[in-house]
Each structure stands twice: as structure tokens, then as C-alpha cells.
């Protein structure tokens, strides 16, 4: 740092002496002991040859000194007066001090009725005093003098001293306001320092500081710290800054010059839109966050978010920050599209690039339908299984099941349904289902039952009687059976063209019809099988019924 000033002291401590008298000057340094090195003395700015720290002087003028550890002291004017009456001021004197003035005659015991004056006016209560105290002096150009009566034999002669300009030293330097920047960037911190220097001869004096913008006090007003930290400067903080320093006793107050501080606004640049989840791929129902940020930009930034095809903005935020977020809750299919954001802190908004948002829709429960050439599917039919989810983002993979067996899968690259074909056999009856999956979770259809019906084959009619030949009174069993065909099968029994009756068979083994024979039962018998897919007729079987003679009865 800067070396402290040396301090020049007088002994006796009066700045005015009578001609012929001697005054001792002592040079002292605050930070170093007196023994350290040479002392340089100056008289009216001329270097004296003496190098001691204490010298005797008899010549008037301005004296200064300097030691190795200090810088040049302030000048002290020492006057050697040839006059008969002198006014002396105690040295040193600082602003705000109470100073002792002494009116001294060359022959002081013959000097009386001393009166003290300031700027030609008599100081109150200053009559006939050896010395007076002037309270709280300041560094003005006030002139002091005194008058007295000198006894000259039997006469009292009034004498007047020469005017005295008291050498009042600055207690502390005039403050200078220093700012860490005169053109701070908006949003940046700034430090204001009210710089002054207290006289090293008065280290015990306590100062307080206050900083101002225009006419407004900054911070908490008076503070013992000369420094004020402003965390962030904004454009409205531009203005004229100054500071004041005063002693805590309010005796001395000094004000700095004004400093103009202009807060600079950085226009926004590099506006960027980011979407969470990253990549902008969302699933319907998720929450989306649109993050608009700027690489640079100060002050209050207005952010806005926009979607292609929408006139009004999605949202707008004005804040002192380099980024802002817009939350879109529970996204829908209609939220898909292109987005951009804008940021503005000057006159015109800067736009980000477009970002595409895709909203993927989980598949809905698919519906399985059958498409067949007829209402009742039969063996050999080509069955089309059609599975379709009415909602769901493509591509959708459909899987087809019979009971629990995976029949196959089919993809719908652009949505819609998918089909699977089966050439039906008797074993394809059962429960069918499908599921749809687009990577967001599979959904299963309800089961749909299919019955593959088999047309009946030509039935075989068998006549069963107790004996080899049918006779009147026998119980005849007519048995009709189709070896192939889906149940239920309705069997019809015929005698000639007459219908004897019908029997429904719900399982294999055919159906039987019983007759108690009479002679009239002779003739042709047949049967018919029908399961709704077309009736099939048996071959005709002839029956001869005879009376009691069994040997004439036979089955053909």
C-alpha cells in the first residue's frame, strides 16, 4: 500500500514564535520507530542537509519532513514575528477540534487587557484572558487577531497582533466514490466504495459512511463500512451516485463528487427451446415442460411459447432470469406439433428454432371380428380374423390367438387394423382373441367364440329286429347314423313317404326310432340327417312283415 505520511510536530507547540526564538521540529512516522534511517527535511521545498529526526529552526517558512517508512508530511508554516504582540495557535489542529489561541506579548508581564477577534469581531467572553478556546474549527479562511495594552513607562499603548490563519489540518480526506464499474452489465453485481483517509494522528476518530443514488439513500443509511455491495444492477439503477463521510460525533461531514453510473443492457441472444422429456417424444397423459433459455441477455426478459397453427401464445413469463419453463399438464394427441419460443429484453423478440413434439397414444382395447363366407363357418371356409384398435399411434403390432396358441402377428404401419387368414378344419372351433401393442403396453381383446360346423355325411339306416325275420308284433328299432357332422343332428325317419318322427342327437352314435310291427309296416324305410348345413338322405331299406309264420319274414 501507500506509505503513511510523516507527521511534523512543534516544540513548543505554537506555529508562531518571536523572532530570535528557537522552535524544535520533530519528524515522526506512525509505522516505524524513530531510529530507523535518515530523516529528510525540507524548508520551502528545499532539501536541508540535516538528517536528524529533530531539528532547531529560527527561520520562518513552510517545513516538511520524510522518513524511510513514510511519505512526505504536510507542510507546517512556522512564523517568526518581529512584532511586539503575536497571536499563537496550538499545532497541530484538525477540523472539528477545539483550538487554543494565546495572545502573547514580547514582554508578556507588561501586557494586559488582551482581547481576541475573529474576522474583525470580538469573540465573546474573550476579554483579558491569557488564552481562549475556539470550538470546532473548520478549514475556512477565518482571520484571528488580538489586541492588548503594553505598559510603556507610565503609558498604556494599545497594540494589535498580525492576523493569524489557523492551519487546520484535514481530519480525513475528501471522499471519492469508487464503483467496481461505471458501466455495469445488467444483472451483474457492483461494489461501491466511499474512499477517504483518516489522519494517522487521529486513529481513534470513528467515521461513518452513507451512499446515495440521486437523492435516495442506498442500503441502511449511515454505516461504519465504506463499502456497499449491490448483488445485481438493473437499468433502473442507472443514475448519479455519491457518498458522504462524517465523524460519528457529526462534527465533520464531507461529500464526494457525483459519479454517473449507466447500467448496460445485454440484448438476448441464442434463444433455445428444450423439451422434457428429452427428444419431445411423449405418451398421452404425460406432463411436458417447455424450457426456453438464452445464452446471453440481461435484465427483465419476456419469454413466450408458441405452437404452429395457433395464433395466441401458449404462455408468457417476464422474469429476471436466463431461462423460463412452461408446464403443459396431461398432454393430448392435439398437443403434437411444432413449437418454438421467443425471448425479448430490448425491442424485438428473438426466436428459437422449431422443435417437433410427438404425442404417442397407447392402444385401446382391440376388437376382434370374424369375416367368413357364411354365418355358420364350415370346414374348408377361409376365415379372416380382423383385429383393430380404434386408438393408438402406429405402428401397431397385432397378435392373433386360438385358445392360448399364437397363430401369428401382423403389423399396421400406419394404424388401423390387421387381418389374419385361416383355412378352417374341424379343430379350429374354440375361443379366439387378439392383442394390440405399439410399444406403450399391449391391450387384449375380448374372446370371440367360433364354431366350425361339419356338414353331415350320408346317414346309414339299420333295421334291428329280435329275429332274422320281422313278424307282426316285433319291436323294430330303426337306427340312423351319420359318421360325420357337427351336432346337434336332427334325424328324420320315413316309411314310404310318411314321416314316422324325428330325434335330435347331441352326441355321436346316431338316433333310434322304435316301431311295434303290423303287416302294414312292410315297405321301404329311409332316414335323413340334418344339422342345418344341408340334409342328407340314407339309402332305402325294404322291410317285409309277415303274420305268424317267421320263415316267410326277412330283412333285405
Amino acid at each position: 500500500g501507500v506509505a503513511p505520511k510523516a507527521v511534523l510536530l512543534l516544540n513548543p507547540p505554537w506555529s508562531t514564535a518571536f523572532k530570535g526564538e528557537k522552535v524544535a521540529l520533530i519528524c515522526s512516522s506512525i509505522s516505524h520507530s524513530l531510529a530507523q534511517g535518515d530523516t529528510y527535511w525540507y524548508h520551502d521545498e528545499k532539501l536541508l542537509k540535516i538528517k536528524h529526526d529533530k531539528i532547531q529552526i529560527t527561520e520562518p517558512g513552510n517545513y516538511q519532513c520524510k522518513t524511510r517508512g513514510s511519505s512526505l508530511s504536510d507542510a507546517v508554516h512556522v512564523e517568526f514575528s518581529p512584532d511586539w504582540l503575536i497571536l499563537q495557535a496550538l499545532h497541530p489542529v484538525f477540523e472539528g477540534d477545539n483550538v487554543i489561541l494565546r495572545c502573547q506579548g514580547k514582554d508578556n508581564k507588561n501586557t494586559h487587557q488582551k482581547v481576541y477577534y475573529k474576522d474583525g469581531k470580538q469573540l465573546p467572553n474573550s476579554y483579558n484572558l491569557e488564552k481562549i478556546t475556539v470550538n470546532s474549527v473548520s478549514r475556512d479562511n477565518s482571520k484571528y487577531h488580538c489586541t492588548a495594552y503594553r505598559k510603556f513607562y507610565i503609558l498604556d499603548i494599545e497594540v494589535t497582533s498580525k492576523p493569524l490563519n489557523i492551519q487546520v489540518q484535514e481530519l480525513f480526506l475528501h471522499p471519492v466514490l469508487r464503483a467496481s464499474s461505471s458501466t455495469p452489465i445488467e444483472g451483474s453485481p457492483m461494489t461501491l466504495t466511499c474512499e477517504t483517509q483518516l489522519s494517522p494522528q487521529r486513529p481513534d476518530v470513528q467515521l461513518q459512511f452513507s451512499l446515495f443514488r440521486d437523492s435516495q439513500t442506498l442500503g441502511l443509511g449511515w454505516s461504519r463500512s465504506p463499502r456497499l455491495q449491490i448483488p445485481a444492477m438493473w437499468t433502473e439503477d442507472s443514475g448519479s451516485y455519491w457518498c458522504e463521510v462524517e465523524t460519528v460525533t457529526h462534527s465533520i461531514k464531507k461529500r464526494s463528487l457525483r459519479s454517473q453510473i449507466r447500467v448496460q443492457r445485454v440484448p438476448v441472444s441464442n434463444v433455445n427451446l428444450e423439451i422434457r422429456p428429452t427428444g419431445g417424444q411423449l405418451i398421452e397423459g404425460e406432463n411436458m415442460v417447455l424450457i426456453c433459455s438464452v445464452a446471453q441477455g440481461s435484465g427483465t426478459v419476456t419469454f413466450s411459447w408458441h405452437k404452429e397453427g395457433r395464433v395466441r401464445s401458449l404462455g408468457r413469463k417476464t422474469q429476471r432470469s436466463l431461462l423460463a419453463e412452461l408446464h403443459v399438464l396431461t398432454v393430448k394427441e392435439s398437443d403434437a406439433g411444432r413449437y418454438y419460443c421467443a425471448a425479448d429484453n430490448v425491442h424485438s423478440p428473438i426466436l428459437s428454432t422449431w422443435i417437433r413434439v410427438t404425442v404417442r397414444i397407447p392402444v385401446s382395447h382391440p376388437v376382434l371380428t370374424f369375416r367368413a363366407p357364411r354365418a355358420h363357418t364350415v370346414v374348408g371356409d377361409l376365415l379372416e380374423l380382423h383385429c383393430e384398435s380404434l386408438r393408438g399411434s402406429p405402428p401397431i403390432l397385432y397378435r392373433f390367438y386360438h385358445e392360448d396358441v399364437t397363430l401369428g402377428n401382423s403389423s399396421a404401419p400406419s394404424g388401423g387394423g390387421a387381418s389374419f387368414n385361416l383355412s378352417l378344419t374341424a379343430e379350429h372351433s374354440g375361443n379366439y382373441s387378439c392383442d394390440a401393442d405399439n410399444g406403450l403396453g399391449a391391450q387384449h381383446s375380448h374372446g370371440v367364440s367360433l364354431r366350425v360346423t361339419v356338414p353331415v355325411s350320408r346317414p346309414v339306416l339299420t333295421l334291428r329286429a329280435p329275429g332274422a325275420q320281422a313278424v307282426v308284433g316285433d319291436l323294430l328299432e330303426l337306427h340312423c347314423e351319420s359318421l360325420r357332422g357337427s351336432f346337434p343332428i336332427l334325424y328324420w325317419f320315413y316309411h314310404e313317404d310318411d314321416t314316422l318322427g324325428n330325434i335330435s342327437a347331441h352326441s355321436g352314435g346316431g338316433a333310434s326310432f322304435n316301431l311295434s310291427l303290423t303287416t302294414e309296416h312292410s315297405g321301404n324305410y329311409s332316414c335323413e340327417a340334418d344339422n342345418g348345413l344341408g340334409a342328407q338322405h340314407s339309402k332305402v331299406v325294404t322291410l317285409n312283415v309277415t303274420g305268424t309264420s317267421r320263415n316267410r319274414t326277412g330283412l333285405t
Epitope: 370346414v379 374348408g380 392360448d404 383355412s423 378344419t425 374341424a426 379343430e427 379350429h428
Partner: antibody
Framework: EVQLQQSGPELWKPGASVKMSCKAS????????MKWVKQSHGKSLEWIGD????????FYNQKFKGKATLTVDKSTSTAYMELNSLTTEDSAVYYC?????????WGQGTTLTVSS | DIVLTQSPANLSVIPGDSVSLSCRAS??????LHWYQQKSQESPRLLIK???QSMSGTPSRFTGSGSGTDFTLTINTVETEDFGMYFC??????????FGGGTKLEIK
């Protein structure tokens, strides 16, 4: 009663082709899929392929594509399997079996020996 | 392809004992698994369909269980006529079928 009667044993030289048969009875031939299975000596079973007798639609195990050809004759309720470009690796017992997802009824098997 | 692993490959038992044969699938095949018995010099015969459904004609001492990837064929009180090979077969992905390597059940 469901029966599958397969043709007798075959002995062929490498490079030849063989066609074996499987005659179905006791059920309606066109109502059920016909399957073919290979069983190498002391080994497990390998599914060769299926044929739907109704329309001749075939499904093959990738391993046997180009090796086996399945056909049917509806009029005689007979299924056929032809194996071409025979090698010693083709020596095995070949079964026909009825069924859609499982092998409900099996033929007695046809033994094929390929030897030079 | 779905791989079926049967264990053990060989199993020696005394008639009257009870045994469990295992079949493990390389992926979930739900209940699409069937069991076959093949006696020496004979064709295979379907015993159990869809993991646990007995075929008509299958003795009640044969029971199937399991679902997904782990399946078991249990023979309670083995009889002399039960000795031979046992195969499992999956039909999960129509029309691609695979068989297990088989378990040989023999008399101790």
C-alpha cells in the same frame, strides 16, 4: 377308429428322391391337418411340416424347406411326403400324424435308409 | 425358436415308485405344452394336452402341471408298461412346433 397307415421301408442311394405315403381312415380326411415328423435313430422328434388337406396349404419347418414336399390326394384320403437329394443324414423313421396343435394320432412310421 | 429342455435325460425307477419329469421352455409358452409316450419300436402316443388335460385312454396315474416356462409330468406309482421315452412338445407359435430331447424312463 382313426388309423394312419404308412408305406413300407425304403432303401435309397444318396442323391435319389423318395415319396412315402400315409393313408387315413376312420375320420373325414379333409377335417384335420396332417403332420410329418422325423425321428433319427436314438434321437428326439423333429417336426417337418403340416398340410391342410382341404386346400393343400402347407407349412414347413425352415430346416426342411427345399428338402420335403407335402401333398394330399383327397379322393384316396392319402397324404404324401417327398424327400429329395437324399443324404445319409436323411436316414430316419418318418411319421405322419393327425392334429392341429398337437399330434393326436400317429402312423406306424416309415423307415428310410440312405446308403451308398 | 422356442427350445424345450427335458430333464433328466435318463431316469431309473422301481415299479411302484412315483416320478416327475421336467420340461423347461426357453420363453413363456403359457399352457401350450403336450406330453407323449413312446415305447420301444412303437409310435409316440399323446398322453396330456395343453399342460394338464388328460386324453381319453390316458391312465389316471399320469398328471401334467405347469404354465409359462416350467412343466412337469408326474407318474404316480409307475407300472412296468410305463417304461419308455417321454417327449414334451410346444405349440405356442402356430405353425412352428418343437419337441424336447426326451427323458428315458427305465427299470432299475
Amino acid at each position: 377308429e382313426v388309423q394312419l397307415q404308412q408305406s413300407g421301408p425304403e432303401l435309397w442311394k444318396p442323391g435319389a428322391s423318395v415319396k412315402m405315403s400315409c393313408k387315413a381312415s376312420g375320420y373325414t380326411f379333409t377335417d384335420y391337418y396332417m403332420k410329418w415328423v422325423k425321428q433319427s435313430h436314438g434321437k428326439s422328434l423333429e417336426w417337418i411340416g403340416d398340410i391342410n388337406p382341404n386346400n393343400g396349404e402347407t407349412f414347413y419347418n425352415q430346416k426342411f424347406k427345399g428338402k420335403a414336399t407335402l401333398t394330399v390326394d383327397k379322393s384316396t384320403s392319402t397324404a404324401y411326403m417327398e424327400l429329395n437329394s437324399l443324404t445319409t443324414e436323411d436316414s430316419a423313421v418318418y411319421y405322419c400324424a393327425r392334429g392341429l396343435y398337437r399330434f393326436d394320432y400317429w402312423g406306424q412310421g416309415t423307415t428310410l435308409t440312405v446308403s451308398s | 425358436d422356442i427350445v424345450l429342455t427335458q430333464s433328466p435325460a435318463n431316469l431309473s425307477v422301481i415299479p411302484g415308485d412315483s416320478v416327475s419329469l421336467s420340461c423347461r421352455a426357453s420363453q413363456n409358452i403359457r399352457n401350450n405344452l403336450h406330453w407323449y409316450q413312446q415305447k420301444s419300436q412303437e409310435s409316440p402316443r399323446l398322453l396330456i394336452k395343453f399342460a394338464s388335460q388328460s386324453m381319453s385312454g390316458t391312465p389316471s396315474r399320469f398328471t401334467g402341471s405347469g404354465s409359462g416356462t416350467d412343466f412337469t409330468l408326474t407318474i404316480n406309482t409307475v407300472e412296468t408298461e410305463d417304461f419308455g421315452m417321454y417327449f414334451c412338445q410346444q405349440s405356442n407359435n402356430w405353425p412352428q412346433y418343437t419337441f424336447g430331447g426326451g427323458t428315458k424312463l427305465e427299470i432299475k
